[in-house]
Interface confidence: medium
Protein backbone atom coordinates (compact mmCIF):
# COMPACT_ATOMS: atom_id res chain seq x y z
CA UNK A 1 0.00 0.00 0.00
CA UNK A 2 1.76 3.10 -1.18
CA UNK A 3 0.69 6.61 -0.37
CA UNK A 4 2.00 9.59 -2.25
CA UNK A 5 2.72 12.69 -0.24
CA UNK A 6 2.19 16.02 -1.93
CA UNK A 7 4.22 19.05 -1.04
CA UNK A 8 2.23 21.84 0.50
CA UNK A 9 3.01 25.54 0.51
CA UNK A 10 4.92 26.96 3.44
CA UNK A 11 2.66 27.98 6.26
CA UNK A 12 3.15 29.11 9.83
CA UNK A 13 1.41 26.94 12.41
CA UNK A 14 1.09 27.46 16.12
CA UNK A 15 2.05 24.30 17.96
CA UNK A 16 4.06 23.04 20.86
CA UNK A 17 7.01 22.01 18.78
CA UNK A 18 7.86 25.13 16.85
CA UNK A 19 7.58 28.85 17.24
CA UNK A 20 5.89 31.08 14.71
CA UNK A 21 8.31 33.42 13.00
CA UNK A 22 6.70 36.41 11.30
CA UNK A 23 9.26 36.64 8.54
CA UNK A 24 12.77 35.64 7.65
CA UNK A 25 15.67 37.70 8.84
CA UNK A 26 17.37 38.64 12.09
CA UNK A 27 15.47 39.22 15.27
CA UNK A 28 15.88 41.27 18.40
CA UNK A 29 17.03 39.51 21.50
CA UNK A 30 14.27 37.19 22.81
CA UNK A 31 14.29 35.18 26.02
CA UNK A 32 17.42 33.00 25.93
CA UNK A 33 17.72 29.27 26.30
CA UNK A 34 20.11 29.04 29.22
CA UNK A 35 22.30 25.98 28.98
CA UNK A 36 23.21 23.87 31.95
CA UNK A 37 26.97 23.58 31.93
CA UNK A 38 27.20 19.90 32.81
CA UNK A 39 29.27 19.20 29.75
CA UNK A 40 31.80 21.48 28.16
CA UNK A 41 32.79 20.99 24.55
CA UNK A 42 35.39 22.79 22.56
CA UNK A 43 34.19 25.55 20.29
CA UNK A 44 34.60 24.95 16.61
CA UNK A 45 35.26 28.57 15.76
CA UNK A 46 36.17 29.94 19.17
CA UNK A 47 32.98 31.96 19.36
CA UNK A 48 32.79 35.70 19.44
CA UNK A 49 35.10 37.80 21.59
CA UNK A 50 33.78 38.13 25.13
CA UNK A 51 31.77 41.23 25.96
CA UNK A 52 32.18 41.93 29.64
CA UNK A 53 33.42 44.70 31.92
CA UNK A 54 35.90 42.65 33.90
CA UNK A 55 39.54 43.48 33.61
CA UNK A 56 41.84 40.53 33.30
CA UNK A 57 45.23 39.66 31.93
CA UNK A 58 44.18 36.35 30.41
CA UNK A 59 41.06 36.60 28.28
CA UNK A 60 41.41 32.97 27.24
CA UNK A 61 40.24 31.92 30.68
CA UNK A 62 36.69 32.75 29.72
CA UNK A 63 34.91 33.26 26.45
CA UNK A 64 31.51 32.94 24.89
CA UNK A 65 31.63 29.88 22.68
CA UNK A 66 29.39 29.03 19.77
CA UNK A 67 28.94 25.27 19.53
CA UNK A 68 27.30 23.69 16.52
CA UNK A 69 24.32 21.50 17.31
CA UNK A 70 22.56 19.40 14.71
CA UNK A 71 19.05 18.20 15.40
CA UNK A 72 15.73 17.30 13.88
CA UNK A 73 12.60 19.37 14.33
CA UNK A 74 9.64 17.33 15.51
CA UNK A 75 5.95 18.04 15.84
CA UNK A 76 3.89 15.18 17.22
CA UNK A 77 4.59 12.14 15.06
CA UNK A 78 6.13 14.26 12.33
CA UNK A 79 9.83 14.95 11.90
CA UNK A 80 11.85 17.22 9.66
CA UNK A 81 13.07 15.55 6.51
CA UNK A 82 16.57 16.80 7.18
CA UNK A 83 18.31 17.93 10.36
CA UNK A 84 18.85 21.59 11.05
CA UNK A 85 22.04 23.05 12.46
CA UNK A 86 22.15 25.88 14.94
CA UNK A 87 24.46 27.25 17.58
CA UNK A 88 24.43 26.50 21.26
CA UNK A 89 25.90 29.19 23.46
CA UNK A 90 28.37 28.02 26.07
CA UNK A 91 31.21 29.38 28.12
CA UNK A 92 31.97 31.78 30.94
CA UNK A 93 31.64 35.50 30.42
CA UNK A 94 33.69 36.69 33.34
CA UNK A 95 36.13 35.56 36.00
CA UNK A 96 34.63 33.45 38.72
CA UNK A 97 33.98 35.93 41.50
CA UNK A 98 32.51 33.59 44.08
CA UNK A 99 31.76 34.04 47.73
CA UNK A 100 31.18 31.29 50.28
CA UNK A 101 27.54 30.87 51.15
CA UNK A 102 26.98 28.37 53.94
CA UNK A 103 23.68 26.55 53.71
CA UNK A 104 23.39 23.95 56.41
CA UNK A 105 26.59 21.97 56.46
CA UNK A 106 27.11 21.96 52.74
CA UNK A 107 29.27 24.52 50.99
CA UNK A 108 27.48 26.44 48.29
CA UNK A 109 28.85 29.19 46.14
CA UNK A 110 27.12 32.13 44.59
CA UNK A 111 28.40 34.59 42.01
CA UNK A 112 29.25 38.11 43.02
CA UNK A 113 28.76 41.22 40.96
CA UNK A 114 26.93 41.62 37.66
CA UNK A 115 25.64 38.38 36.19
CA UNK A 116 26.86 38.05 32.62
CA UNK A 117 25.91 35.00 30.61
CA UNK A 118 26.79 33.62 27.23
CA UNK A 119 23.38 33.72 25.59
CA UNK A 120 21.92 33.93 22.08
CA UNK A 121 22.44 37.28 20.43
CA UNK A 122 20.95 36.87 16.98
CA UNK A 123 18.44 34.45 15.56
CA UNK A 124 17.58 33.28 12.11
CA UNK A 125 14.44 31.70 10.77
CA UNK A 126 14.50 28.56 8.69
CA UNK A 127 11.74 26.92 6.77
CA UNK A 128 11.43 23.22 7.55
CA UNK A 129 9.35 20.53 5.95
CA UNK A 130 8.07 17.91 8.37
CA UNK A 131 7.32 14.43 7.12
CA UNK A 132 4.40 12.70 8.80
CA UNK A 133 3.76 8.96 8.92
CA UNK A 134 0.56 7.14 8.18
CA UNK A 135 -0.20 8.87 4.91
CA UNK A 136 -0.61 12.27 6.53
CA UNK A 137 0.34 15.24 4.36
CA UNK A 138 3.67 16.95 5.06
CA UNK A 139 3.65 19.96 7.33
CA UNK A 140 5.59 23.17 6.90
CA UNK A 141 7.11 25.06 9.80
CA UNK A 142 9.25 28.10 10.38
CA UNK A 143 11.64 27.60 13.26
CA UNK A 144 13.82 30.11 15.06
CA UNK A 145 17.44 29.04 15.35
CA UNK A 146 20.31 30.64 17.21
CA UNK A 147 22.67 32.37 14.80
CA UNK A 148 25.19 33.95 17.18
CA UNK A 149 26.09 34.19 20.85
CA UNK A 150 27.22 37.06 23.03
CA UNK A 151 28.04 37.79 26.64
CA UNK A 152 25.19 39.83 28.04
CA UNK A 153 24.11 41.09 31.41
CA UNK A 154 21.08 39.15 32.62
CA UNK A 155 18.06 41.33 33.27
CA UNK A 156 14.72 40.65 34.89
CA UNK A 157 13.47 39.99 31.40
CA UNK A 158 15.93 37.14 31.05
CA UNK A 159 15.51 35.75 34.54
CA UNK A 160 11.73 35.67 34.48
CA UNK A 161 11.33 34.40 30.96
CA UNK A 162 10.13 30.87 30.50
CA UNK A 163 12.77 28.74 28.88
CA UNK A 164 11.58 27.93 25.40
CA UNK A 165 12.02 24.60 23.67
CA UNK A 166 11.27 24.24 20.02
CA UNK A 167 10.50 20.55 20.05
CA UNK A 168 13.68 19.46 18.45
CA UNK A 169 15.29 16.09 18.40
CA UNK A 170 19.06 15.85 18.52
CA UNK A 171 20.61 14.36 15.43
CA UNK A 172 23.99 12.77 15.02
CA UNK A 173 26.66 15.48 15.29
CA UNK A 174 28.62 16.73 12.35
CA UNK A 175 32.08 15.35 11.91
CA UNK A 176 34.46 16.53 14.58
CA UNK A 177 31.71 18.12 16.62
CA UNK A 178 30.07 16.94 19.79
CA UNK A 179 26.58 18.04 20.75
CA UNK A 180 25.73 19.14 24.26
CA UNK A 181 22.56 17.94 25.93
CA UNK A 182 19.91 20.62 25.81
CA UNK A 183 17.41 21.56 28.46
CA UNK A 184 14.06 20.13 27.43
CA UNK A 185 10.69 21.54 28.32
CA UNK A 186 7.80 19.40 29.46
CA UNK A 187 5.93 20.39 26.34
CA UNK A 188 8.54 18.96 24.06
CA UNK A 189 7.84 15.51 22.73
CA UNK A 190 10.04 12.77 24.09
CA UNK A 191 13.01 13.64 21.96
CA UNK A 192 16.03 11.44 22.43
CA UNK A 193 19.51 11.44 21.05
CA UNK A 194 19.61 9.80 17.68
CA UNK A 195 21.36 6.51 17.20
CA UNK A 196 24.06 6.57 14.58
CA UNK A 197 22.69 4.40 11.84
Amino acid sequence: HHHHHHHQGWQAFKNDATEIIPELGEYPEPPPELENNKTMNRAENGGRPPHHPFETKDVSEYSCRELHFTRYVTDGPCRSAKPVTELVCSGQCGPARLLPNAIGRGKWWRPSGPDFRCIPDRYRAQRVQLLCPGGEAPRARKVRLVASCKCKRLTRFHNQSELKDFGTEAARPQKGRKPRPRARSAKANQAELENAY
Epitope: Y72, E169, E192, E194, Y197
Partner: nanobody, 120 residues
Framework: EVQLVESGGGLVQPGGSLRLSCAAS????????MGWYRQAPGKQRELVAT???????NYADSVKGRFTISRDNAKNTVYLQMNSLKPEDTAVYYC??????????????WGQGTQVTVSS
Protein backbone atom coordinates in the same frame (compact mmCIF):
# COMPACT_ATOMS: atom_id res chain seq x y z
CA GLU B 1 8.90 -5.62 -1.34
CA VAL B 2 8.39 -4.86 2.34
CA GLN B 3 6.03 -6.92 4.45
CA LEU B 4 4.69 -6.13 7.92
CA VAL B 5 3.51 -8.98 10.11
CA GLU B 6 1.58 -8.12 13.27
CA SER B 7 0.95 -10.40 16.24
CA GLY B 8 -0.12 -10.28 19.86
CA GLY B 9 -3.75 -9.28 19.55
CA GLY B 10 -6.56 -11.03 21.36
CA LEU B 11 -9.29 -10.82 23.94
CA VAL B 12 -8.47 -9.29 27.31
CA GLN B 13 -10.44 -8.07 30.30
CA PRO B 14 -10.55 -4.39 31.27
CA GLY B 15 -7.44 -3.46 33.19
CA GLY B 16 -5.46 -6.21 31.51
CA SER B 17 -2.39 -6.04 29.31
CA LEU B 18 -1.34 -7.06 25.82
CA ARG B 19 1.86 -6.71 23.84
CA LEU B 20 1.65 -6.24 20.10
CA SER B 21 4.59 -6.93 17.80
CA CYS B 22 5.17 -5.89 14.21
CA ALA B 23 8.05 -7.37 12.26
CA ALA B 24 9.13 -5.74 9.01
CA SER B 25 10.90 -7.78 6.37
CA UNK B 26 12.41 -6.83 3.05
CA UNK B 27 14.58 -3.95 1.97
CA UNK B 28 14.14 -1.28 4.60
CA UNK B 29 16.02 2.01 4.68
CA UNK B 30 17.62 2.93 7.97
CA UNK B 31 15.86 6.28 8.33
CA UNK B 32 12.31 5.26 9.06
CA UNK B 33 9.32 5.58 11.32
CA MET B 34 7.23 2.71 12.60
CA GLY B 35 3.94 3.12 14.34
CA TRP B 36 0.65 1.73 15.45
CA TYR B 37 -2.73 2.95 14.32
CA ARG B 38 -6.14 1.60 15.23
CA GLN B 39 -9.59 1.56 13.74
CA ALA B 40 -12.73 0.81 15.71
CA PRO B 41 -15.94 -0.23 13.94
CA GLY B 42 -17.58 2.74 12.29
CA LYS B 43 -14.69 5.07 13.10
CA GLN B 44 -11.73 6.46 11.22
CA ARG B 45 -8.25 5.07 11.60
CA GLU B 46 -6.37 6.98 14.30
CA LEU B 47 -2.78 7.20 15.43
CA VAL B 48 -1.88 5.32 18.60
CA ALA B 49 1.89 5.71 18.82
CA THR B 50 4.91 6.17 16.57
CA UNK B 51 8.64 5.75 16.98
CA UNK B 52 11.39 6.89 14.63
CA UNK B 53 14.60 4.99 14.06
CA UNK B 54 16.23 7.82 15.99
CA UNK B 55 14.11 7.03 19.04
CA UNK B 56 11.66 9.95 18.91
CA UNK B 57 8.27 8.77 20.14
CA ASN B 58 4.78 10.19 20.03
CA TYR B 59 1.54 9.02 21.63
CA ALA B 60 -2.13 9.77 21.22
CA ASP B 61 -3.46 11.58 24.27
CA SER B 62 -5.89 8.77 24.96
CA VAL B 63 -3.10 6.22 25.51
CA LYS B 64 -0.42 8.31 27.21
CA GLY B 65 0.74 6.69 30.42
CA ARG B 66 -0.84 3.36 29.52
CA PHE B 67 0.82 2.35 26.25
CA THR B 68 4.54 2.19 25.54
CA ILE B 69 6.03 1.90 22.06
CA SER B 70 9.53 0.52 21.55
CA ARG B 71 11.56 -0.95 18.76
CA ASP B 72 14.46 -3.21 17.95
CA ASN B 73 16.27 -1.63 15.01
CA ALA B 74 18.38 -4.72 14.44
CA LYS B 75 15.27 -6.83 14.00
CA ASN B 76 13.19 -4.14 12.30
CA THR B 77 10.50 -4.84 14.85
CA VAL B 78 8.24 -2.45 16.74
CA TYR B 79 6.37 -3.31 19.93
CA LEU B 80 3.35 -1.81 21.64
CA GLN B 81 2.97 -2.63 25.31
CA MET B 82 -0.63 -1.93 26.26
CA ASN B 83 -1.47 -1.74 29.96
CA SER B 84 -4.65 -0.78 31.83
CA LEU B 85 -6.71 -1.58 28.77
CA LYS B 86 -10.18 -0.12 28.48
CA PRO B 87 -13.20 -1.22 26.43
CA GLU B 88 -12.70 1.84 24.24
CA ASP B 89 -9.31 0.44 23.21
CA THR B 90 -11.14 -2.27 21.27
CA ALA B 91 -10.16 -1.97 17.62
CA VAL B 92 -8.12 -3.46 14.83
CA TYR B 93 -4.52 -2.34 15.35
CA TYR B 94 -2.44 -1.69 12.25
CA CYS B 95 1.31 -1.45 11.96
CA UNK B 96 2.76 1.25 9.71
CA UNK B 97 6.24 1.73 8.27
CA UNK B 98 7.45 4.82 6.45
CA UNK B 99 10.99 5.22 5.15
CA UNK B 100 12.85 8.34 4.14
CA UNK B 101 15.53 8.67 1.48
CA UNK B 102 17.29 11.95 0.70
CA UNK B 103 14.73 13.93 2.61
CA UNK B 104 11.57 12.57 1.01
CA UNK B 105 9.27 9.62 1.58
CA UNK B 106 10.38 6.49 -0.16
CA UNK B 107 7.56 4.25 0.95
CA UNK B 108 4.61 3.90 3.26
CA UNK B 109 3.55 0.37 4.17
CA TRP B 110 0.69 -1.03 6.22
CA GLY B 111 0.19 -4.37 7.93
CA GLN B 112 -2.97 -6.42 7.71
CA GLY B 113 -4.02 -5.58 11.26
CA THR B 114 -4.55 -7.52 14.48
CA GLN B 115 -7.76 -7.48 16.50
CA VAL B 116 -7.69 -6.28 20.10
CA THR B 117 -10.88 -6.76 22.10
CA VAL B 118 -11.25 -5.47 25.64
CA SER B 119 -14.33 -6.92 27.26
CA SER B 120 -15.43 -8.54 30.48
Amino acid sequence: EVQLVESGGGLVQPGGSLRLSCAASGSIFSDNVMGWYRQAPGKQRELVATIWSSGHTNYADSVKGRFTISRDNAKNTVYLQMNSLKPEDTAVYYCNLGTIVTGTWRSDYWGQGTQVTVSS
